[in-house]
């Protein structure tokens, strides 16, 4: 029985050239998180494995930093970074939970950042 829910930063915007923190938080379950995958559309950005720690995909190594917590920091943003991002929580015994974040990267300097929070 999957009782958990994923809270995300939702729809967020950021300035071109800047950075943004993508955060998801799994709540309302005692399930053990075995791994969190971060994906952009169908591209794997990073993995945080409970045993092995972080792995950043080679093609994103220069612009993606692990954390804070199970979140992901995107740096040197470009307009091409606009799109959907997914946090995929593999848990035991519940199974797989998926959260969605939409990021819009703006040319303007008046980009408003969405709410952010850190995993305790």
């Amino acid at each position: 029985m999957m009782t958990g829910t994923i809270e995300t930063t939702g729809n967020i915007s950021a300035e071109k050239g800047g950075s943004i923190i993508l955060q998801c938080h799994l709540s309302s379950t005692t399930a053990q998180v075995t791994q969190v995958n971060w994906e952009q559309q169908d591209q794997l950005l990073a993995i945080c494995n409970a045993d092995l720690g972080w792995h950043i995909s080679p093609s994103f190594k220069d612009r993606v930093a692990p954390g804070p917590g199970l979140g992901l920091t995107l740096q040197s943003l470009t307009v091409n970074d606009t799109g959907e991002y997914f946090c995929i929580y593999h848990t035991y015994p519940d199974g797989t939970y998926t959260g969605r974040i939409f990021l819009e990267v703006l040319e303007s300097s008046v980009a408003e950042h969405g709410a952010r929070f850190q995993i305790p």
Epitope: Q35, A50, L52, D94
Partner: antibody
Amino acid sequence: EVMLVESGGGLVKPGGSLKLSCAASGFTFSSYTMSWVRQTPEKRLEWAATISGGGGNTYYPDSVKGRFTISRDNAKNTLYLQMSSLRSEDTALYYCARWLPTYYAMDYWGQGTSVTVSS
Amino acid sequence: DIQMNQSPSSLSASLGDTITITCHASQNINVWLNWYQQKPGNTPKLLIYKASKLHTGVPSRFSGSGSGTGFTLTISSLQPEDIATYSCQQGQSYPYTFGGGTKLEIN
């Protein structure tokens, strides 16, 4: 080349024990989650146990919980399945399998070792 | 447990045909559905993961689709080497469960 070679299967009486081994080569064994999956005489596949790369976390279906223990020796590149209190319904071909790093699916399987539980 | 119902259980087709195998989950599994091929006397081989993603080295005549509870595996331009049993597996929740398999034969 990724290779997974199982051994240790055989004929055992109900209530008996058996320990299966899976020798891995061709990849960094400690970086991969591994599983045992069995195939019944009716050819249906059943997940039997999973262990994380470092060996710190193990997962089982209710049907084998408390009777089967999955473990690994990363220094020897070997995966194990200790089976006890065996039942006739445990009769199957047992495969060891490697999970994709994304943890979405099992990408390599061994050839399997046969376990028959019968009096 | 999530039940995976696969159909048909067996299928006979001719070389060059396009065939479709379906897998139905007893509850929503999003896109967490994998397809495996097992040739006679051989070990299972991953074909498709995450419902539609072709595993490395798998010919493009294989394709997968679906989400939620309904999924299909399609093999176009059937080849002799496609003779095998095909099984689906859900990765949405523990215990991971498999379909009963579809045995594909060539006419």
